[in-house]
Amino acid sequence: FNLSYPITPWRFKLSCMPPNSTYDYFLLPAGLSKNTSNLNGHYETAVEFNSSDTHFSNLSKTTFHCCFRSEQDRNCSLCADNIEGKTFVSTVNSSVFQQMGANWNIQCWLKGDLKLFICYVESLFKNPFKNYKHKVHLLYVLPEVLEDSPLVPQKGSFQMVHCNCSVHERCECLVPVPTAKLNDTLLMCLKITSGGVIFQSPLMSVQPINMVKPDPPLGLRMEITDDGNLKISWSSPPLVPFPLQYEVKYSENSTTVIREADKIVSATSLLVDGILPGSSYEVQVRGKRLDGPGIWSDWSTPHVFTTQDVIYFPPKILTSVGSNVSFHCIYKNENKIVSSKKIVWWMNLAEKIPQSQYDVVSDHVSKVTFFNLNETKPRGKFTYDAVYCCNEHECHHRYAELYVIDVNINISCETDGHLTKMTCRWSTNTIQSLAGSTLQLRYRRSSLYCFDIPSIHPISKPKDCYLQSDGFYECVFQPIFLLSGYTMWIRINHPLGSLDSPPTCVLPDSVVKPLPPSSVKAEIIKNIGLLKISWEKPVFPENNLQFQIRYGLSGKEIQWKMYDVYDAKSKSVSLPVPDFCAVYAVQVRCKRSDGLGLWSNWSNPAYTVVMDIKVPMRGPEFWRIINGDTMKKEKNVTLLWKPLMKNDSLCSVQRYVINHHTSCNGTWSEDVGNHTKFTFLWTEQAHTVTVLAINSIGASVANFNLTFSWPMSKVNIVQSLSAYPLNSSCVILSWILSPSDYKLMYFIIEWKNLNEDGEIKWLRISSSVKKYYIHDHFIPIEKYQFSLYPIFMEGVGKPKIINSFAQDNTEKHQNDEQKLISEEDLGGEQKLISEEDLHHHHHH
């Protein structure tokens, strides 16, 4: 295709003259205009003909072949699809054409999206055909293989596109180029029909990839850098397949100076130094291929950035507790930049920062440094400290922001009992939350163990962590390398920068939380009454383990007791417990004996089963009610007793047995099952009864006896009995005894509210007691009956019965309530019994 004209990435001129009939191809004139720059900065090749050397008379029935001209090639190639034998009637003014010829400006490029090749055809101002409506067609071909076809492609192989000439005498021709053919050579020629004449360009050739005109750069922005420069930055347009160079033009306009600059850079940013407060910066950028031919993009839209009267750099700092940071400032006041020596710094407009922390960087730049910073305490909605740069005593309302965060985040890890994963937890509760920040756990694994001092390695990996309901983040490492050191830290990412918590190194093998011991069993050993606890150690870890046992009475709130087992071979332990008959809950956990790792969870609780471990300690306390005529010899006696408590029954009572003994009938027993009441007929002079408690092991050995004796029921040793109401919950009963030859075993106190259809209440008390505090509910003005029965070895004596509270000394006894009653006062015993206890003595 050495016959084709290679299109350049700039504008060129197509010139057309009437043909000379003596030549097959018309001669090209010798004159070639110099490459001149047009207004918009593009370069154009102007090919012009000297029309005065050529004479022609008839323009009709003619196709004009036009040419481009270059120094190297003085030939014109014809488009293969040349139209012949067509007659055109020309209406053009021949003298004008004869003088000037017809000229068009042409510029072509590949659009930034790399899909369309565009050519613009524009009629030049001094064009005799300018006023005529013209049609433009572009014929093109993308040959498959260039090397095989040294000649011009044949007629019919060209495709034709109609160009759009709707705007301002500029026609737009669009050639679609497949992505795969961007590096191929595109052949094309133009046909312009105007004023009844066809003008045809020579064959043109182009590689579209060398004619790319990128879209303008995007996202133009400006910011003041931390070191006080103006950073202009932008993004390259999308889809560009090669690096670009950029032309940046900017102007600075301030009250003191106006400067303009134009710079070409290959990066997507440019630093401008010597920034001034209260200035306006206007910037535009365009782009062009960096390492080959191409066309400059259009300029981006202008972007304006105005600096404030006080410039802080950096304007905001995010840092961690204990660090040192510096702020710089340039202060403009009433169109004058304040001398840095006159600048004073304040914190939150409340405290002046000492001069010792200032540095004069230059005439206009002052610097303040903060050392060993403390955490910023939030003030209302403000989570930063405001740092003010002031002109002696005058402070501008603008300030710099200082965010100091305590990044001490504790990361705790544990390796599961199967040694398959390590779970690490951390919480942000300790650190001040900063809007816009994200937290991420980062880690680096060493091949073996941890270093003495963990450090943050530049190469690390992030770990996904998930927020749990307890406010902690949880991250799982799986699989794990037990003996690798995992150095980890929390990175706080924020638009102002990122901070790292102090790193910690964890060896999965050192944080193993074993599985809890299994097969935990608990039982109370018969006859001994010890709590025996047994367990099996978990399979992992294989290290020696220590065990911890907790045990306590089963219930809603268990009061645990702890017991440690340090012998790794131990599988059971027996412990003394105060109550053999209670249900004990037992749990076991374990931990490595060498102190490393964590305690396992507690095992599932094991519970003791309450079983009888011994015969009951004693039979129940009992009393009687005698029904029937007191004068009759035969009386119905109803025995009453409280169900035996567990600590006496050891641990249950299956049934009660009444043993009878009389002089006539000898001894016999009656099984009353689990009733707590039994009636029998008292017919003989003396009848002794004993109530035995029976459990699965046997019968109680220590039992209470009660002898019903006619002669003893007349023995009267209770001289007097008095009842003093202390308050509505306590009555003092006191008595005086007369001497007796009989062996006094104990007393029974009985009482009843005679105004109510309630029960008789009774208590057994020591024979040594002379005064007793009955705790129950009493209404002092209601009628009560109190009875005191002396119980002798030989039988039940005559009771003393009173129906009223004592009338004398009531006040004195009420005052007694305030005093501590001595053992002597109480005859050696002060019995306090609750209503609940009393209930067991009640008889309905």
């Epitope: 105004n755 003005i781 209601e782 009628k783 009223s804 209503e835």
Partner: antibody, heavy 117, light 108 residues
Framework: EVQLVESGGSVVRPGESLRLSCAAS????????MSWVRQAPGKGLEWVSG????????VYADSVKGRFTVSRDNAKNSLYLQMNSLRAEDTALYHC??????????WGQGTLVTVSS | DIQMTQSPSSLSASVGDRVTITCRAS??????LNWYQQKPGKAPKLLIY???SLQSGVPSRFSGSGSGTDFTLTISSLQPEDFATYYC??????????FGQGTRLEIK
């Protein structure tokens, strides 16, 4: 049928005295303690005094302690309330009641005492 | 002294309604609480003793419940003769016996 009938209520001046009586019938009087309960016009019930079945124990509300004395005559099945140093705030309908269940199971219709200058 | 507080102070209801009156003690009084009914110009009448025991001769539509500090008197189906003032009274700590301020039950 248990019956309690109060008497002795009248209009008196502040500082004066008055003795109320309550005649009981229909039950064994000396088996029960007795109480006086008053009710100021349009107000609620206020316990005043109590006496045990045999008169051995007497109890009073703080508001009347030292001014009122309760007594009984079991032979006459009668209950009394001696009211001295009367005040305007003592104006009320005075009920006698049989003591039971820590309260009162039978009440008289009441006698009106008005203390006014 | 133990204070007794009744609520509501008054309430309107219709015949056949189920009505609940509550009484609260300033400290625990176990089950030592009585309920009384008083009609205008009449002497009070004992309804319930020991928090839940029905006094003989009182209709079974009256019931009491509660222990400790909170107690309720319930009338399951209000009858015309039930419109009256109701009082609660504690007998836990005596003397003194203390009453609630009363709840007036009136026809809607």
């Amino acid at each position: 049928e248990v019956q309690l009938v109060e008497s002795g209520g009248s209009v008196v001046r502040p500082g004066e005295s008055l003795r109320l009586s309550c005649a009981a019938s229909g039950f064994t009087f000396d088996d029960y303690g007795m109480s006086w309960v008053r009710q100021a016009p349009g107000k609620g019930l206020e316990w005043v005094s109590g006496i045990s079945w045999n008169g051995g124990i007497t109890v009073y509300a703080d508001s009347v302690k030292g001014r009122f004395t309760v007594s009984r005559d079991n032979a006459k099945n009668s209950l009394y309330l001696q009211m001295n140093s009367l005040r305007a705030e003592d104006t009320a309908l005075y009920h006698c009641a049989r003591a039971r269940y820590g309260g009162a199971d039978y009440w008289g219709q009441g006698t009106l005492v008005t203390v006014s200058s | 002294d133990i204070q007794m507080t009744q609520s509501p102070s008054s309430l309107s209801a219709s015949v056949g309604d189920r009505v609940t009156i509550t009484c609260r003690a300033s400290q625990s009084i176990s089950s030592y609480l009585n309920w009384y009914q008083q009609k205008p110009g009449k002497a009070p009448k004992l309804l319930i003793y020991a928090a839940s025991s029905l006094q003989s001769g009182v209709p079974s539509r009256f019931s009491g419940s509660g222990s400790g500090t909170d107690f309720t008197l319930t009338i399951s189906s209000l009858q015309p003769e039930d419109f009256a003032t109701y009082y609660c009274q504690q007998s836990y700590s005596t003397p003194p016996i203390t009453f609630g301020q009363g709840t007036r039950l009136e026809i809607k």
